[in-house]
């Protein structure tokens, strides 16, 4: 009778996480009597599968009864494939023998791979807002595919963005992989509504590609712009001063009113009109009681933007009967502490 | 249903010869090591003889050149030809089934006695 | 020749005891060990194959175990029917051999 062959007939077979995996492995014998074993990799350092003589191994499953005694077939079944599964398999014969088992006879092994899906790409912003003009970076993570191959793409608003770099890890071969990817993006004032999308393509995805999306709005700071304008009145001893604060985001604001470097009134804005590209607007108004000034006042609208340095606008009010309606504005963007007086530097 | 069944034993004078039948059914007999099994009276279980799938077969020393072991696939019989038998001989003999993969005994017929007497 | 011993020879005990007997081979043997139960005027019973791994249809209470040189076959709690006498086998290689048997009688 011829001498035994161990036939592993797949050089490779490719399993998706989660799924069973089956290994084929056929005898042309039974001689000589002894168990089959299956091993993962080769050498001193492989480990046991599946033991026909004894041992418990809940994942595996014989493919073919192996109680019969005409069976050749000692195909294996592996429930539950995860990428740590990956790696050649060996269907081996073994003698009966006596301290140890002594291997007869190996097939020649039978690679499985683990196609394993990405995890749902996470992208993450600047941890500090950025005013429009500035670049801030943008990085997207995925993780545990396999096999390494993989394409990821950048989006802003549907446009495909070109400054970024990307890195998958390890480098060499390994059960699972990682991607990592930072993008750069130049923020501009209409970025309130805008969107960044990493996209990540991959064989497990049968074309239907991963998105991770970021808000530019959680990334941008857009600071105001300050308007201070005095309003006619019927009466003549009142004056009626407005501050228009525009286009600014996000929302948090407060305002602080000064009558020649004095603070008059401190408020929070609330109520905010939202423009159409996301940002707001807010008017605050002083009522000035023109009888309680023998001079000219200044007026000064400061503005704390999104726990920025204030930036403020003044207005000089002039109590002239003959002028009531006229007057010149000043704007200063320095840091003026509430109860600073006009032209302090800050 | 899987049975081994014995026959062709009795009573022999030293010196005479038997032939043992075991009759499988159940299972191809040919795709099992056999094996015969003896107790004398009141003694233990003795190892006999086999024959493997090949055909290989393997003997006991002191019944060594005096026992034959053979099968006929066609039948699907095992038999065990005794030549020279002694006193010692006396004794239930058994035939065994070896397991699939280790050849452990799994299935056991009910065994046939063999009286070697003058 | 592979010798296997085994002890005691025979063992009282009552029915609901947990009983051992041991088996020692001259020289490892790997782990095919087997064990067999056999009561007066009948065939043997094969029980457990590779020291520990028990036949189809043997119950649970009958346990193997060891590996080399030294095996046990434990009855977890006997009942009237496992009183019988039972051998210990080494089939590593031929010759196969026995243990000369342990009788389990009734106390």
């Known amino acids: 009778e011829d001498e035994l062959q161990v036939i592993q007939p797949e050089k490779s077979v490719s399993v998706a996480a989660g799924e069973s995996a089956t290994l084929r492995c056929a005898m042309t014998s039974l001689i000589p009597v002894g168990p089959i074993m299956w091993f993962r990799g080769a050498g001193a350092g492989r480990e046991l599968i599946y033991n026909q003589k004894e041992g418990h191994f809940p994942r595996v499953t014989t493919v073919s009864e192996l109680t019969k005694r005409n069976n050749l077939d000692f195909s294996i079944s592996i429930s539950n494939i995860t990428p740590a599964d990956a790696g050649t398999y060996y269907c081996v014969k073994f003698r009966k023998g006596s301290p140890d088992d002594v291997e007869f006879k190996s097939g020649a092994g039978t690679e499985l791979s683990v196609r394993a899906k990405p995890s749902a790409p996470v992208v993450s912003g600047p941890a500090v807002r950025a005013t429009p003009e500035h670049t801030v970076s943008f990085t997207c993570e995925s993780h545990g595919f396999s096999p390494r191959d993989i394409t990821l793409k950048w989006f802003k608003n549907g446009n495909e963005l070109s400054d970024f770099q990307t890195n998958v890890d390890p480098a060499g071969d390994s059960v699972s992989y990682s991607i990592h990817s930072t993008a750069r993006v130049v923020l501009t004032r209409g970025d309130v509504h805008s969107q960044v999308i990493c996209e990540i393509a991959h064989i497990t995805l049968q074309g239907d590609p991963l998105r991770g999306t970021a808000n530019l709005s959680e990334a941008i700071r857009v600071p105001p712009t300050l308007e201070v304008t005095q309003q006619p009145m019927r009466a003549e001893n009142q004056a009626n001063v407005t501050c228009q604060v525009s286009n600014f985001y996000p929302r948090g604001l407060q305002l602080t009113w000064l009558e020649n470097g004095n603070v008059s009134r401190t408020e929070t804005a609330s109520t905010l009109i939202e423009n159409k590209d996301g940002t707001y607007n807010w008017m605050s108004w002083l009522l000035v009681n023109t009888c309680a000034h023998r001079d000219d006042v200044v007026l000064t609208c400061q503005v704390e933007h999104d726990g920025q340095q204030a930036v403020s606008k003044s207005y000089a009010l002039e109590i002239s009967a003959h002028q009531k309606e006229h007057g010149s504005d000043i704007t200063h963007e320095a840091a003026l502490a509430p109860t600073a007086p006009l032209g302090g530097s800050g | 249903e899987v049975q081994l069944v014995e026959s062709g034993g009795g009573l022999v004078q030293p010196g005479g010869s038997l032939r043992l039948s075991c009759a499988a059914s159940g299972f191809t007999l040919s795709s099992y090591d056999m094996h015969w099994v003896r107790q004398a009276p009141g003694k233990g279980l003795e190892w006999v003889s086999a024959i493997g799938t090949a055909g290989d077969t393997y003997y006991t020393g002191s019944v060594k050149g005096r026992f034959t072991i053979s099968r006929e696939n066609a039948k699907n019989s095992l038999y065990l030809q005794m030549n020279s038998l002694r006193a010692e001989d006396t004794a239930v003999y058994y035939c065994v089934r070896g397991g699939v993969w280790d050849d452990a005994f799994d299935i056991w017929g009910q065994g046939t006695m063999v009286t070697v007497s003058s | 020749d592979i010798q296997m011993t085994q002890s005691p020879s025979s063992l009282s005990a009552s029915v609901g005891d947990r009983v051992t007997i041991t088996c020692r081979a001259s020289?490892?043997?790997?782990?095919?060990a087997a064990w067999f139960q056999q009561k007066p005027g009948k065939a043997p019973k094969s029980l457990i194959y590779?020291?520990?791994s028990l036949h189809s249809g043997v119950p649970s209470k009958f346990s193997g175990s060891g590996s080399g040189t030294d095996f046990t076959l434990t009855i977890s709690s006997l009942q009237p029917e496992d009183f019988a006498t039972y051998y210990c086998?080494?089939?590593?290689?031929?010759?196969?051999?026995f243990g000369q048997g342990t009788k389990l009688e009734i106390k």
């Open positions: 086998q080494q089939y590593v290689s031929y010759p196969y051999t």
């Open positions: 020289q490892g043997i790997n782990n095919y």
């Open positions: 590779t020291a520990s």
